[in-house]
Interface confidence: low
């Protein structure tokens, strides 16, 4: 019997926190050898499958979902699953996305203090939380 | 029009002090963070220093080039920045940006003010 | 601190040609990567922001690619205006570093 595979992550490029009519990635990580990534709505009513996996480091693969330019249709929580191997995955932790006009005039541009961040968004600032590693993708509100 | 006018530049000793003041304009100054950027005679871009906003405690940050010497600080009141730069060193010499970002890229700069330590 | 390594630092090209130029970090930085030019005496001016995002105005011709630690720039159909200074920033952490600069030349 096969163990349990890996739940996937998720995170949103450059951030979680959009403007209308920008441009944003949510991207899904798992294993290597992953077949096809999902992402879904927190309902199921949609979702999108890509077969379009690149290795994004020796023990992790990751599917890439760009949005071009946002609406409020796209705001909302977002989780991730993959196939490997015939079996589906379990899912991810949900990502919320957030869809607010800011005219660029806001102090955090990632997100707002109470969100959580993924992965590839900005860590604290290293001169103020000198034990935070640069991979641990603290909420931006540390740094700006 | 975001319109960012940086005043205060000069000729100054080694050891020296300055204060650069930013009138900003056209834009709701207080709930943006603000940066100083530095270039040298003929060289790259240094970031200098940084602001966040009332929100966020004026929370300061800066190049380790400067630490210790350059201070940050605004007036939110005036939309004015500043940045006070003592004990300065020859290699402070360059042209100093007041920049304002934009989802945090520094997207409005300033037409900058000369800086020059010398003997 | 996260260095940006530029590449070329010098690069020379016609009128019409496209180039690209680009732009290592030392650690991931996802897309926090913003691409300006800066024409001789003036202040710099951002034409890519989040990796991949035209900023406000700036012409088409202008395309930015990349995430992570490799990122690149590309001029398409280069124009006269284009040859100037052109500079990568990561804005992932403070400091908030630059790379070291491109020059364009007309050949």
């Known amino acids: 019997q096969e163990g349990p595979l890996p739940r996937p992550s998720i995170s949103a490029e450059p951030g979680t926190v959009i403007p209308p009519g920008r441009p944003v990635t949510i991207v899904c990580r798992g294993p290597v050898g992953v077949d096809q990534f999902r992402l879904e709505r927190e309902d199921r009513s949609k979702f999108n499958d890509t077969k379009d996996v690149s290795q994004a480091s020796p023990s992790e693969s990751e599917a890439r979902f760009r949005i071009d330019s946002v609406s409020e249709g796209n705001a909302g929580h977002y989780r991730c699953l993959y196939v490997k191997s015939t079996r589906w995955s379990e899912h991810s932790d949900y990502l919320d996305l957030v869809v607010k006009e800011t005219s660029g005039d806001t102090d955090s541009p990632v997100t707002e203090p109470d969100s959580s961040a993924g992965p590839t968004q900005r860590p604290s600032d290293n001169s103020h939380n000198e034990h935070a590693p640069a991979s641990q993708g603290l909420s931006a509100e540390h740094l700006y | 029009e975001v319109q960012l006018v940086e005043t205060g530049g000069g000729l100054v000793q080694p050891k020296g002090s300055l204060k650069l003041s930013c009138a900003a304009s056209?834009?709701?100054?207080?709930?943006?963070?603000m940066n100083w950027v530095r270039q040298a005679p003929g060289k790259g871009l240094e970031w200098v220093a940084r602001?966040?906003?009332?929100?966020?405690?004026?929370?300061?940050f800066y190049a380790d080039s400067v630490k210790d010497r350059f201070t940050i600080s605004r007036d939110d009141s005036q939309s004015m920045l500043y940045l006070q730069m003592n004990n300065l060193k020859t290699d402070d010499t360059a042209m100093y940006y007041c920049?304002?970002?934009?989802?945090?890229?520094?997207?409005?700069w300033g037409q900058g003010t000369p800086v020059t330590v010398s003997a | 601190d996260i260095q940006m390594t530029q590449s070329p630092a010098s690069q020379s090209a016609s009128l019409g040609e496209s180039v690209t130029i680009t732009c290592l970090a030392s650690?991931?930085?996802?897309?926090?990567l913003g691409w300006y030019r800066q024409k001789p005496g003036k202040s710099p001016q951002l034409l890519i922001y989040?990796?991949?995002s035209l900023a406000d105005g700036v012409p088409s011709r202008f395309s930015g690619s990349g995430s992570g630690t490799k990122f690149s720039f590309k001029i398409s159909s280069l124009q006269a205006e284009d040859f100037v200074i052109y500079y990568c920033?990561?804005?992932?952490?403070?400091?908030?570093?630059f790379g070291s600069g491109t020059k364009l030349e007309i050949k």
């Open positions: 920049v304002r970002d934009r989802a945090g890229f520094f997207a409005y």
């Open positions: 602001i966040r906003t009332k929100n966020n405690n004026y929370a300061t």
């Open positions: 920033q990561q804005l992932y952490s403070t400091p908030l570093t």
């Open positions: 989040a990796a991949t």
């Open positions: 650690q991931t930085i996802g897309t926090w």
């Open positions: 056209g834009f709701t100054f207080n709930i943006n963070a």
